[in-house]
């Protein structure tokens, strides 16, 4: 039975040219996390974090994506095209798969604030 819940940074905004941390947290379960996938809006993989093999940032994103903190992902040099949904998928044993969603809005405004509150989707 899947007892866990995924908490995410929810809806966040950040300014163009800046950076943002995408963060998901799995709680309320003792399941072992074996892999975390980070996907962007079209479901292409930004990165994989394998518990044994470590991080792999896919080549298309390696210049602008950094692993961490933790199981999260840092997007750098943001462009307007980065606006959209991002998904974290936690592969766990024995529970199975948990999935979280984050919506990132990239703003032109220089006064855009990066709101990073945790919320349960």
């Amino acid at each position: 039975m899947m007892t866990g819940t995924i908490e995410t940074t929810g809806n966040i905004s950040a300014k163009k040219g800046g950076s943002v941390i995408l963060q998901c947290h799995l709680s309320s379960t003792m399941a072992q996390v074996t892999q975390v996938n980070w996907e962007q809006h079209d479901h292409s993989l930004l990165a994989i974090r394998n518990a044994e093999l470590g991080w792999h940032i896919y080549p298309a994103f390696k210049d602008r994506v950094a692993p961490g903190p933790g199981l999260g992902l840092t997007l750098q040099s943001l462009t307007m095209n980065d606006t959209g949904e991002y998904f974290c998928t936690y592969h766990t044993y024995p529970d199975g798969t948990y999935r979280g969603r984050i919506f990132l809005e990239v703003l032109e405004s220089s006064v855009a604030e990066h709101s990073a509150r945790f919320q349960i989707p």
Epitope: T34, Q35, N37, S44, L45, I48, N50, A51, E52, L53, H56, Y58, P59, A60, F61, H91, Y93
Partner: antibody, heavy 120, light 107 residues
């Protein structure tokens, strides 16, 4: 030298679930650094990557197929499997399994393929 | 998805000929390009990865070049066992995608 061998029914009825197994010999499916992929080739067409799985269960599926695909691993039998649900004639293809280098998806060792026809 | 286009789709050549196959991607993929050989009823075989790195055990008559969007597989002196189909694959982003293949036939 690692060898891979696909097996499963060659004929599946429309709307049913296609189920294939890949048996790995000459090496352990649990050896680090490798994922295990399924690829298919429609008659007269190019190859299409379906997805991959790690021996501990982590997966990634092609977004175009992910709603119908499930992959699993049986380390005790040194096998990994593909299930494709709600098949149609468009799923008629030769299905291959392949060892896959972690991260950058390089398919460095393949099975010889098994043909699957979807027909009533 | 990144589209991979190969040309020609087929070619006829003789033993000893120099054969060149091209692969073009719909966007830049740096050097994340792999080449495979396919024979009917046989397991496909990785020939070249990262555009130009020869896979272990592959004869040196095979070579790859290119970066960005344009890539080439060259067989310097075609041997009888080289009559087969060849396809390219990008591993720059997911999902990985393949070219339509080039069939090398005996003239």
């Amino acid at each position: 030298q690692v060898q891979l061998q696909e097996s499963g029914p060659g004929l599946v009825k429309p709307s049913q679930t296609l189920s294939l197994t890949c048996t790995v010999s000459g090496g352990s499916i649990s050896s680090g650094g490798y994922y295990w992929s399924w690829i298919r080739q429609h008659p007269g067409k190019g190859l299409e990557w379906i997805g991959y799985i790690y021996y501990r269960g982590g997966t990634y599926y092609n977004p175009s197929l992910r709603s119908r695909v499930t992959m699993s691993v049986d380390t005790s039998k040194n096998q990994f499997s593909l299930m494709l649900s709600s098949v149609t004639a468009a799923d008629t293809a030769v299905y291959y399994c392949a060892r896959t280098i972690f991260g950058v998806i390089i398919l460095d060792n393949w099975g010889q393929g098994t043909p699957v026809t979807v027909s009533s | 998805d990144i589209q991979m286009t190969q040309s020609p789709s087929s070619l006829s050549a003789s033993v000893g000929d120099r054969v060149t196959i091209t692969c073009r991607s719909s966007q830049s993929i740096s050097s994340y390009l792999n080449w495979y050989q396919q024979k009917p009823g046989r397991a496909p075989k990785l020939l070249i990865h990262a555009a130009s790195s020869l896979q272990s055990g592959v004869p040196s008559r095979f070579s790859g070049s290119g970066s960005g969007t344009d890539f080439t597989l060259t067989i310097s002196s075609l041997q009888p066992e080289d009559f087969a189909s060849y396809c390219c694959q990008q591993s720059y982003t997911t999902p990985p995608t393949f070219g339509g293949g080039t069939k090398v036939e005996i003239k």
